[in-house]
Interface confidence: medium
C-alpha cells in the first residue's frame, strides 16, 4: 500500500476533523507538560501542511514519514529542555530512534494538577462560547494525563462528551442531567485507559507473541463459532492496530481500526451472531460496540479436546511442524469451550501444555509422557476459583470500603516500600473487583475478576517501574505476564522491611477534611491506614480496626463541632497518643 505522501493518505482517509483530533492526542501524549495553546498551534501547522500535500503529493516534504514530520514539529518547541530535561536529547536522534526515545519518556504519572470540575453554568457557557476549543481541551487534558489512552476510543469519548453538553446545557436542571453523565465518562475513561495500558505493556514488555496469545484466547471466547483461520485473521489485524497505537502511530491505528470494524461487519456471518446491532452504528460507536460485544453462544456439538491434543498419535508431529499454529489451535479450542475461564488462566493452561509437549516430544514414549497433561490443569483452574470465592465472601461481608481497607492492609504488608499514594490507588481499584464482579453468576465471575485484576496490577507495575523500590514488585511484574496475579497473591508479609519512623504530622488533620466528598474523605482515611501499617507492619487486624474506628469517630465529631479547627488540633493529639498506645508505637 505505498502512497507517495503518507500524511496526505491519512488526511484523506480520516477526514480533517479526526486528523486534527488524532494529531492533538499524539502531541499531548508525547509532550505532556506543554500548554494547550502551544499544542493547538502545532496541530494547525501540521494540518495546513497536510492540506498542501493533499493538493499536491509531490510537494516538498510530503514524502516524509509521519514520525519524521511529527518529530520535527515537536522538536521546534522552544522550551523543550527547560520543561522536559533529557527528553530534549531525543531531538538529536534520527528516526526511528527519535520516536523510540519520545516513547520511552512517556510518563504514566505526570506531575499535573488534578482536574477540577468547574460549576455547570461555567462549563455550559464555555461550551456554547467555543464548542471546538472546549472539545479540543477535553482531548488534550485526557491525553496528557493518559499517554497510552487508545486514541480512536478517545474520539468516541469526546463524541459522548459533546453529546452530554449539547443535551444537558439546554435542560431545565443542567446539573442533574450533566453531572451523572460526566461521572460515567470519567469512570469509563479511567477503566478504558487502564485496559489499554495493559495491552501496551503486553506488547512492549513481553512482545507480539504474548499479545497475540491474549487476543487468540479472548476472541475465541467471544467468537466461538468462528473458524480458527478467521480468529487468526482478526488477531493479526488487531495486533497491528494496537502495535500502532502503543507506538504512537495514531493516524495509522485509527485508520486500521476502522478497516477492521468494516471487515468484521462485512463478514459477521462467519464471525458472530451478536454483531448485528453494532454493525448498524456509525464508525466510532461501531468500533466501541464490537470491542465490548458479548460472547456468542458456543456451538452445540463441540467434540472433546482430548482426541486432537492428547489421544492423537500425531500430537508431536503437528506440534513440531508448526509450533505456534498448533498451540494457537489448542488455545482457540480451549478458549471457545471456556467462556467461564479468565484469559490469563487459559494462557496458563496453554503454557503448561506447551511445556509438557516440549518435554514429552523429546522423550522415549511421548504419548505415555503427555497422556495425563489435562490432569495438570486441575490445580491451575481451582486456584483462581477458590481465591474468587473467598474474596467475594469477604466483600459481601464487609462492603466495598472495608473490603478495600482489608486489601490495603494486605498489600501494604506484602510490599511496604511502595509509595502510599500508589498503594491507596491500586488497593482501592483492587477492591472495586467486588462490586464489579461478585454480583455475577459463577460462570462469569472468573473472567470478570481475574482479567480485571490483571489490569489493576499492571497499573502497579507501570507506576513502580518509574521509581522502582521493591524487588518483589519488580519480580512479580517482569517474570510472567500471566502469572502476575498469582505471584502477588503468593507474597507473604515482607519480613525484611524496617518499619517507618513515626511522624505525627502524617496523622494531623484539619477542618478542610469536612468539606471533602465522601470519596476524598475515604482516600484520606485510607492514606492514614497505609501509613499506620508502614509504621507497625505487625499490627493485627483487630488493632488496626480499633484505630480506624476511633479515627472515623474523631473526624465525625470534629466536623460537627462549632470550632472545627480547634477540635481537630486538640482531639487529634489525643487520637495520636491513643493510637500509639494501642499499637505499641
Amino acid at each position: 500500500d505505498a502512497h507517495k505522501s503518507e500524511v496526505a493518505h491519512r488526511f484523506k482517509d480520516l477526514g480533517e476533523e479526526n486528523f486534527k483530533a488524532l494529531v492533538l492526542i499524539a502531541f499531548a501524549q508525547y509532550l505532556q507538560q506543554c500548554p494547550f495553546e502551544d499544542h493547538v498551534k502545532l496541530v494547525n501547522e501540521v494540518t495546513e501542511f497536510a492540506k498542501t500535500c493533499v493538493a499536491d503529493e509531490s510537494a516538498e516534504n510530503c514524502d516524509k514519514s509521519l514520525h519524521t514530520l511529527f518529530g520535527d514539529k515537536l522538536c521546534t518547541v522552544a522550551t523543550l529542555r527547560e520543561t522536559y530535561g533529557e527528553m530534549a536529547d531525543c531531538c538529536a536522534k534520527q528516526e526511528p530512534e527519535r520516536n523510540e526515545c519520545f516513547l520511552q519518556h512517556k510518563d504514566d504519572n505526570p506531575n499535573l494538577p488534578r482536574l477540577v470540575r468547574p460549576e455547570v453554568d461555567v462549563m455550559c457557557t464555555a461550551f456554547h462560547d467555543n464548542e471546538e476549543t472546549f472539545l479540543k481541551k477535553y482531548l488534550y487534558e485526557i491525553a496528557r494525563r493518559h499517554p497510552y489512552f487508545y486514541a480512536p476510543e478517545l474520539l468516541f469519548f469526546a463524541k459522548r462528551y459533546k453529546a452530554a453538553f449539547t443535551e444537558c446545557c439546554q435542560a431545565a436542571d443542567k446539573a442533574a442531567c450533566l453531572l451523572p453523565k460526566l461521572d460515567e465518562l470519567r469512570d469509563e475513561g479511567k477503566a478504558s485507559s487502564a485496559k489499554q495500558r495493559l495491552k501496551c505493556a503486553s506488547l512492549q514488555k513481553f512482545g507480539e507473541r504474548a499479545f497475540k496469545a491474549w487476543a487468540v484466547a479472548r476472541l475465541s471466547q467471544r467468537f466461538p463459532k468462528a473458524e480458527f483461520a478467521e480468529v487468526s485473521k482478526l488477531v493479526t489485524d488487531l495486533t497491528k492496530v494496537h502495535t500502532e497505537c502503543c507506538h504512537g502511530d495514531l493516524l495509522e491505528c485509527a485508520d486500521d481500526r476502522a478497516d477492521l470494524a468494516k471487515y468484521i461487519c462485512e463478514n459477521q456471518d462467519s464471525i458472530s451472531s451478536k454483531l448485528k446491532e453494532c454493525c448498524e452504528k456509525p464508525l466510532l460507536e461501531k468500533s466501541h460496540c464490537i470491542a465490548e460485544v458479548e460472547n456468542d453462544e458456543m456451538p452445540a456439538d463441540l467434540p472433546s479436546l482430548a482426541a486432537d491434543f492428547v489421544e492423537s498419535k500425531d500430537v508431536c508431529k503437528n506440534y513440531a511442524e508448526a509450533k505456534d499454529v498448533f498451540l494457537g489451535m489448542f488455545l482457540y479450542e480451549y478458549a471457545r469451550r471456556h467462556p467461564d475461564y479468565s484469559v490469563v488462566l487459559l494462557l496458563r493452561l496453554a503454557k503448561t501444555y506447551e511445556t509438557t509437549l516440549e518435554k514429552c516430544c523429546a522423550a522415549a514414549d511421548p504419548h505415555e509422557c503427555y497422556a495425563k497433561v489435562f490432569d495438570e490443569f486441575k490445580p491451575l483452574v481451582e486456584e483462581p476459583q477458590n481465591l474468587i470465592k473467598q474474596n467475594c465472601e469477604l466483600f459481601e461481608q464487609l462492603g466495598e470500603y472495608k473490603f478495600q481497607n482489608a486489601l490495603l492492609v494486605r498489600y501494604t504488608k506484602k510490599v511496604p516500600q511502595v509509595s502510599t499514594p500508589t498503594l491507596v490507588e491500586v488497593s482501592r481499584n483492587l477492591g472495586k473487583v467486588g462490586s464489579k464482579c461478585c454480583k455475577h453468576p459463577e460462570a462469569k465471575r472468573m473472567p470478570c475478576a481475574e482479567d480485571y485484576l490483571s489490569v489493576v496490577l499492571n497499573q502497579l507495575c507501570v507506576l513502580h517501574e518509574k521509581t522502582p523500590v521493591s524487588d518483589r514488585v519488580t519480580k512479580c511484574c517482569t517474570e510472567s505476564l500471566v502469572n502476575r496475579r498469582p505471584c502477588f497473591s503468593a507474597l507473604e508479609v515482607d519480613e525484611t522491611y524496617v518499619p517507618k519512623e513515626f511522624n505525627a504530622e502524617t496523622f494531623t488533620f484539619h477542618a478542610d477534611i469536612c468539606t471533602l466528598s465522601e470519596k476524598e474523605r475515604q482516600i484520606k482515611k485510607q492514606t492514614a491506614l497505609v501509613e499506620l501499617v508502614k509504621h507497625k507492619p505487625k499490627a493485627t487486624k483487630e488493632q488496626l480496626k480499633a484505630v480506624m474506628d476511633d479515627f472515623a469517630a474523631f473526624v465525625e465529631k470534629c466536623c460537627k463541632a462549632d470550632d472545627k479547627e480547634t477540635c481537630f488540633a486538640e482531639e487529634g493529639k489525643k487520637l495520636v497518643a491513643a493510637s500509639q498506645a494501642a499499637l505499641g508505637l
Partner: nanobody, 119 residues
Framework: EVQLLESGGGVVQPGGSLRLSCAAS????????MLWVRQAPGKGLEWVSV????????YYADSVKGRFTISRDNSKNTLYLQMNSLRAEDTALYYC????????????WGQGTLVTVKS
C-alpha cells in the same frame, strides 16, 4: 459438488523453483481459508501453508518458511504456492485443501500434484 484441482508439479533440480496452482469450484472460495498439505513417499500428511480468505494473514510450516509463498486470486477461485530454493526433502505429493473448521481434520482436498526435487 466440491472440486479442487492441483497442477504445476514436476521434476526440478535442487535450488530450483515451481509454482503450483489449485482451481476450486463447488463452494464459496472467497469465504474459505485454504491450505497446502504434502505427503512425502512413505510418510504422513504434513501441512505446508495456510492462507486466510482475504489473503492475509498467511502461515507457513517452519520447514518451508522464507522459501515458499502462498497466495490466492479470489476472482479466479484459484490458490497458488510459489516454491523457491527447493530441496530434496520437499519431494512429495502436494494437495490443496479447504482449511478445517476447527480441528486438525481437513474438509476437502484434491487429487494432488507431484513435486520431485533431484539433481
Amino acid at each position: 459438488e466440491v472440486q479442487l484441482l492441483e497442477s504445476g508439479g514436476g521434476v526440478v533440480q535442487p535450488g530450483g523453483s515451481l509454482r503450483l496452482s489449485c482451481a476450486a469450484s463447488g463452494f464459496t472460495f472467497d469465504t474459505s481459508s485454504m491450505l497446502w498439505v504434502r505427503q512425502a513417499p512413505g510418510k504422513g500428511l504434513e501441512w505446508v501453508s495456510v492462507i486466510h480468505q482475504s489473503g492475509t494473514p498467511t502461515y507457513y510450516a517452519d520447514s518451508v518458511k522464507g522459501r515458499f509463498t502462498i497466495s490466492r486470486d479470489n476472482s479466479k477461485n484459484t490458490l497458488y504456492l510459489q516454491m523457491n530454493s527447493l530441496r530434496a526433502e520437499d519431494t512429495a505429493l502436494y494437495y490443496c485443501a479447504k482449511f478445517p473448521s476447527s480441528r486438525m481434520k481437513f474438509d476437502y482436498w484434491g487429487q494432488g500434484t507431484l513435486v520431485t526435487v533431484k539433481s
